[in-house]
Interface confidence: low
């Protein structure tokens, strides 16, 4: 029996590197570490709400305190971070809000990446009055523990006056610290008395110590790094998505598959087709077809639109998404009408998602 | 044509490290694919093992996870597997092999294999 | 992991067979199902992909089909050049695992 190839019988081959996928984005809400958060559910009626965080059940604990629609987390940590739905369960239907947690010192020490306010911390002394260094802004070096998801930006400030204006250099873990301790290096804006390293790695864990001299005296000041490991997550799907569809022979159809995914998702969409006038062959299995796929000879593999429907294009459609943690897949149904019958959307039915590890 | 080659020693010693290496040509590894270890023992049983993606990432077998690395050399378009603390059930024919995605259900170019024996 | 159960364990067939391999996945792996063809010596060949596709190359005389969790790979009419080990593998969920083989030799 004859087997379906892919669109048009695409090989496998990419015609080019795969790029980052552009996936939906959700809403962020950005904590320090040890503050609390709340969150309200951005849903109405909803009757009955329950939560997850990337995919998973989310229960109330200690710090997890679930109260009607809101959520609050309290002491927030850079594992509280990821993708977190709520969804209200109303009697005829269910529907899924979706925005993400992100704890981080991104921008350490207190201050702005563009250091707006840093020139008032270059502090110009009188020159007949000699001083020893001494810090200009302790409140902005309170927080000595730092900890980062990867690939996020650090910056250590020590704003700091004397006369004659002091020098300032930095030491990793008590020692010198050189450019080509790191990839990518650091960035020492003088100025604004502040190290700067870009897209942390894990191996930038440590102690950085900021000398502060003059001929009149020395200070220092340390600040403990700790990078956090991102877990990455396998792709979400958006409940409610795709949603089933019904439309008159000759109309023209859309389905709609938003994806969350922090690494790049790769989308399927596949249909469960006929095949001499069975769905199923002689093994009592269904004959499938895949329709769309992300990376070949596609554009926008998150939606598939169908054009001038026959009764033959009716049935489940199923859209699944695979990075390298795993997959998921959730379908639709396409009913198609005779023409003298006006189409209606159809209530949003969920497929039950198919969350694999 | 992509052409895949593994390479490295023969027989190791138990509690000894192995490292080996897959040598790819006509494609870079940094377009695209995931660059997978596969291990074959005797008797034919096939195991994965793990892969590294176009990008860097990695996926490893819970199973290994442990003892095995798998890493790459983007100058010379070649990636790595490394695992430690080898024992006589580590003896097999490796392959290296790539494969489109994760649920793309194929590996579609295959190395021709490097046996392995571990003994002492 | 999921375990695939790959049977028979060894096939004896004459030129001109047909024949049946079947794999069963201890559970649902969609349609991420591939086979695969290993001659002595030689690594493993793609054959079918998704389940039911052909590979690039492959004559038409390899088919596959199932879904879920019951898979099968039929050769309409076996040729000498046939005589190998088949393989099923799963790339459904990680671990992606292989079925044991079946080794196809002339009665």
């Known amino acids: 029996r004859p087997s379906f190839s892919l669109v048009e019988d695409t090989t496998l081959e990419p015609e080019e590197p795969p790029t980052k996928y552009q996936i939906s984005q959700p809403e962020v809400y950005v904590a320090a570490p040890g503050e609390s958060l709340e969150v309200r559910c951005l849903l109405k009626d909803a009757a009955v709400i329950s939560w997850t965080k990337d995919g998973v059940h989310l229960g109330p604990n200690n710090r997890t305190v679930l109260i009607g629609e809101y959520l609050q987390i309290k002491g927030a940590t850079p594992r509280d971070s990821g993708l977190y739905a709520c969804t209200a369960s109303r009697t005829v239907d269910s529907e899924t809000w979706y925005f993400m947690v992100n704890v981080t010192d991104a921008i350490s020490s207190g201050d702005d990446e563009d250091d707006t306010d840093g020139a008032e911390d270059f502090v110009s002394e009188n020159s007949n009055n000699k001083r020893a260094p001494y810090w200009t802004n302790t409140e902005k070096m309170e927080k000595r523990l730092h900890a980062v998801p990867a690939a996020n930006t650090v910056k250590f400030r020590c704003p700091a006056g004397g006369n004659p204006m002091p020098t300032m250099r930095w030491l990793k873990n008590g020692k010198e610290f050189k450019q080509e301790h790191r990839i990518g290096g650091y960035k020492v804006r003088n100025q604004h008395w502040s190290l700067i390293m870009e897209s942390v790695v894990p191996s930038d864990k440590g102690n950085y110590t900021c000398v502060v001299e003059n001929e009149y005296g020395s200070i220092n000041h340390t600040y403990h790094l700790d990078v956090v490991e991102r877990s990455p997550h396998r792709p979400i799907l958006q409940a409610g998505l795709p949603a089933n569809a019904s439309t008159v022979v000759g109309g023209d159809v859309e389905f709609v598959c938003k994806v969350y995914s922090d690494a790049q998702p790769h989308i399927q969409w596949i249909k469960h087709v006929e095949k001499n006038g069975s769905k199923y062959g002689p093994d009592g299995l269904p004959y499938l077809k895949v329709l769309k796929h992300s990376g070949i000879n596609s554009s926008n593999a998150e939606v598939l639109a169908l054009f001038n429907v026959t009764e033959a294009d009716a049935g489940e459609y199923i859209c699944k998404v695979s990075n390298y943690i795993g997959q998921a897949n959730q379908s639709a149904w396409l009913t198609v009408l005779p023409k003298q019958q006006a189409p209606g959307r159809e209530k949003e039915i969920t497929a039950s998602p198919d969350y694999l590890e | 044509d992509v052409h895949l080659q593994e390479s490295g020693p023969g027989l190791v010693k138990p509690s000894q490290s192995l490292s080996l290496t897959c040598s790819v040509t006509g494609y870079s590894i940094t377009s695209g694919y995931y660059w997978n270890w596969i291990r074959q023992f005797p008797g034919n049983k096939l195991e994965w093992m793990g892969y590294?993606?176009?990008?860097?990432?990695?996926n490893y077998n819970p199973s290994l996870k442990n003892r095995l690395s798998i890493t790459r050399d983007t100058s010379k378009n070649q990636f790595f597997l490394q695992l430690s603390s080898l024992t006589t059930e580590d003896t097999a024919t490796y392959f290296c092999?790539?494969?489109?995605?994760?649920?793309?259900?194929?590996?579609?170019?295959w190395g021709t294999g490097t046996t392995v024996t571990v003994s002492s | 992991s999921i375990v695939m159960t790959q049977t028979p364990k060894i096939l004896l067939v004459s030129a001109g067979d047909r024949v049946t391999i079947t794999c069963k996945a201890s559970q649902s792996v969609s349609n991420d199902v591939a086979w695969y063809q290993q001659k002595p010596g030689q690594s493993p060949k793609l054959l079918i992909y998704?389940?039911?596709n052909r590979y690039t190359g492959v004559p038409d005389r390899f088919t596959g089909s199932g879904y879920g969790t019951d898979f099968t790979f039929t050769i309409s009419t076996v040729q000498a050049e046939d005589l190998a080990v088949y393989f099923c593998?799963?790339?459904?969920?990680?671990?992606?695992?292989f079925g044991s083989g079946t080794k196809l030799e002339i009665k």
């Open positions: 998704y389940a039911s």
């Open positions: 593998h799963q790339d459904h969920t990680s671990p992606f695992t």
């Open positions: 092999a790539r494969v489109y995605y994760y649920g793309s259900g194929n590996f579609d170019v």
């Open positions: 590294i993606t176009y990008d860097g990432s990695n």
